[in-house]
Interface confidence: low
Amino acid sequence: WELTILHTNDVHSRLEQTSEDSSKCVNASRCMGGVARLFTKVQQIRRAEPNVLLLDAGDQYQGTIWFTVYKGAEVAHFMNALRYDAMALGNHEFDNGVEGLIEPLLKEAKFPILSANIKAKGPLASQISGLYLPYKVLPVGDEVVGIVGYTSKETPFLSNPGTNLVFEDEITALQPEVDKLKTLNVNKIIALGHSGFEMDKLIAQKVRGVDVVVGGHSNTFLYTGNPPSKEVPAGKYPFIVTSDDGRKVPVVQAYAFGKYLGYLKIEFDERGNVISSHGNPILLNSSIPEDPSIKADINKWRIKLDNYSTQELGKTIVYLDGSSQSCRFRECNMGNLICDAMINNNLRHTDEMFWNHVSMCILNGGGIRSPIDERNNGTITWENLAAVLPFGGTFDLVQLKGSTLKKAFEHSVHRYGQSTGEFLQVGGIHVVYDLSRKPGDRVVKLDVLCTKCRVPSYDPLKMDEVYKVILPNFLANGGDGFQMIKDELLRHDSGDQDINVVSTYISKMKVIYPAVEGRIKFS
């Protein structure tokens, strides 16, 4: 019996087609992805093949103005339209709190939403009961397939799930659910979840009874043969893991942003064992037409976005200096504003010993593309912020050793004075440079804000200590020459859309007046 698994993950609000790098579509003839194009391909496969499941491995939420405005209603609407069969909860599904998950998505989805390792307690338990499930048995042709869900147990550090949801260890939580499926005579089981490729592989190895793992969170691109676009494969598709009980378990992921549709064909024997698996992600490029019905609906929903982007988010009573002349040479108040917003967006008081889990932000000055003039009645709109942060990136959480941070700050000024983008703006960091010294030895003082303290204060950076830092995904991926970050980071979790972080902060503060306050000094 053959099953076709179509899968997406980390779509992050890319409902419309995008450019090849998953930013805003500029030249339509070269654009990719989007739900209208995805629908065309899914329907084509559904017509051609008998047993098809369309699955999503989480993080539909967060990433573009679509989510900012519609807050998840767009996810439910278009996933319903595409007739997804199941979805696993990702960490970003909790970005607007539990209510922001329940109302727009859980109550509106016409497909099961899954996670076996999230347990509700207190008053929330009855409120959320039945709205998400640990697993679901789906009839496919003449057979049944069990889908069991999982979510990153780091979610409390990455999003806003509140205090009434417990995120258990994935493997511990999955095993009893898979065992229960077995007692229901379900012998074909897919683990669908959002914990990253390393955990996906562990689940394939450790959870008895799981036949296939469909994952997300790490934006992993797997491919067999010559890859069709810019993404470099982390391994073959599917990636085969040998389980502890000797089975070959295919593990798949489909990069991110709706650029690819994962396509995996599995052949099962009559006892539900995987005999063979093969496939590849399908690049959703412009050779695949956008479905006109879905496209019309996208255009209908777009109207509200255009209206939103010109509305006032808040006011500034000072000039927000985002000029290259400032942000690539010295501390600029636009950099301070953005870093303050980044830290504020990551406030998670999850431990009495720590006032917060992260206190530091770094931001490449070249990523700040425009100032905002306060003389327009102080008004700040989404449109204004899109000029400051036009690349559609995310502000991510990484863990780095102090020695890596020191290298990053040396790189920040290694060719100072040429208006290059790698000059770092900061938050929760005091840095002093001496430009008279040779490149690679210009950082004379680097103090960082403590987290394990009741009264935050600045202490000297310790080379062997592991620190959490918020930074743009561009830097996490080694952009602007920050190869040491990419090579040496110990953990990387994708964060929220950059503009959304800053706009939320401004809306919260209502009136802002960031200053230049001595975070970056030259001796």
Partner: antibody, heavy 119, light 107 residues
Framework: QVQLVQSGAEVKKPGASVKVSCKAS????????MHWVRQAPGQGLEWMGA????????SYAQKFQGRVTMTVDTSTSTVYMELSSLRSEDTAVYYC????????????WGQGTLVTVSS | DIQMTQSPSSLSASVGDRVTITCKAS??????LAWYQQKPGKAPKLLLY???SLETGVPSRFSGSGSGTDYTLTISSLQPEDFATYYC?????????FGGGTKVEIK
């Protein structure tokens, strides 16, 4: 309360044009679509098109493309629908109707304007 | 265009009767369905949207159900003021289209 008040009945000759107005009050005019729906005598309802006053975005039913023009005057919260090259089968009651921007069902309707096309 | 087929086109019923009107779409409309009531010489009035959501001020004797392409409007106990023509409308795909109407008359 929400009100949509339309202009009065019109009698037109074949080939002529008619312009019907719809004045809105009681809500934020620029945040809802305004639709035009017509109903021929004894017949059902037929959607003609819609305009979003917030940015002037218009969508027309293919059937009326080239013959219908929808415009908006935000200063008076008024939407206009002009239908040209009239023929006898355009005799109908024309309604304006408010629709939410993301879900196009019609929660408030004008009282209707009867347009009679006769030689 | 999506065709909306309503049935029956007319029906006779008495006060207190349970009345059911069906609406079939020519393709899936993903629960983007509204129902309207129209009385002679008057504009239509919204009863339900999203298949099941009752518009404010509409009596609870009106209810909706269905999914995919098949939808139903039910009036649990017909009242004198309910004698009218009822229309369904899909708002999934432009152009938005209406059913042909069902006239509910007094038996």
């Amino acid at each position: 309360q929400v009100q949509l008040v339309q202009s009065g009945a019109e009698v037109k000759k074949p080939g002529a044009s008619v312009k019907v107005s719809c004045k809105a009050s009681g809500y934020t005019f620029t945040t809802y679509n305004m639709h035009w729906v017509r109903q021929a005598p004894g017949q059902g309802l037929e959607w003609m098109g819609a305009i979003f006053p917030g940015n002037g975005h218009i969508s027309y039913a293919q059937k009326f493309q080239g013959r219908v023009t929808m415009t908006v005057d935000t200063s008076t919260s008024t939407v206009y629908m002009e239908l040209s090259s009239l023929r006898s089968e355009d005799t109908a009651v024309y309604y304006c109707a408010r629709g939410d921007y993301d879900e196009s069902y019609f929660d408030y309707w004008g009282q209707g304007t009867l347009v009679t096309v006769s030689s | 265009d999506i065709q909306m087929t309503q049935s029956p086109s007319s029906l006779s019923a008495s006060v207190g009767d349970r009345v059911t009107i069906t609406c079939k779409a020519s393709e899936g409309i993903y629960n983007r369905l509204a129902w309207y009531q129209q009385k002679p010489g008057k504009a239509p009035k919204l009863l339900l949207y999203g298949v099941i959501s009752l518009e404010t001020g509409v009596p609870s004797r009106f209810s909706g159900s269905g999914s995919g392409t098949d939808y139903t409007l039910t009036i649990s106990s017909l009242q004198p003021e309910d004698f009218a023509t009822y229309y369904c409308q899909q708002y999934w795909s432009i152009p938005w289209t209406f059913g042909g109407g069902t006239k509910v008359e007094i038996k």
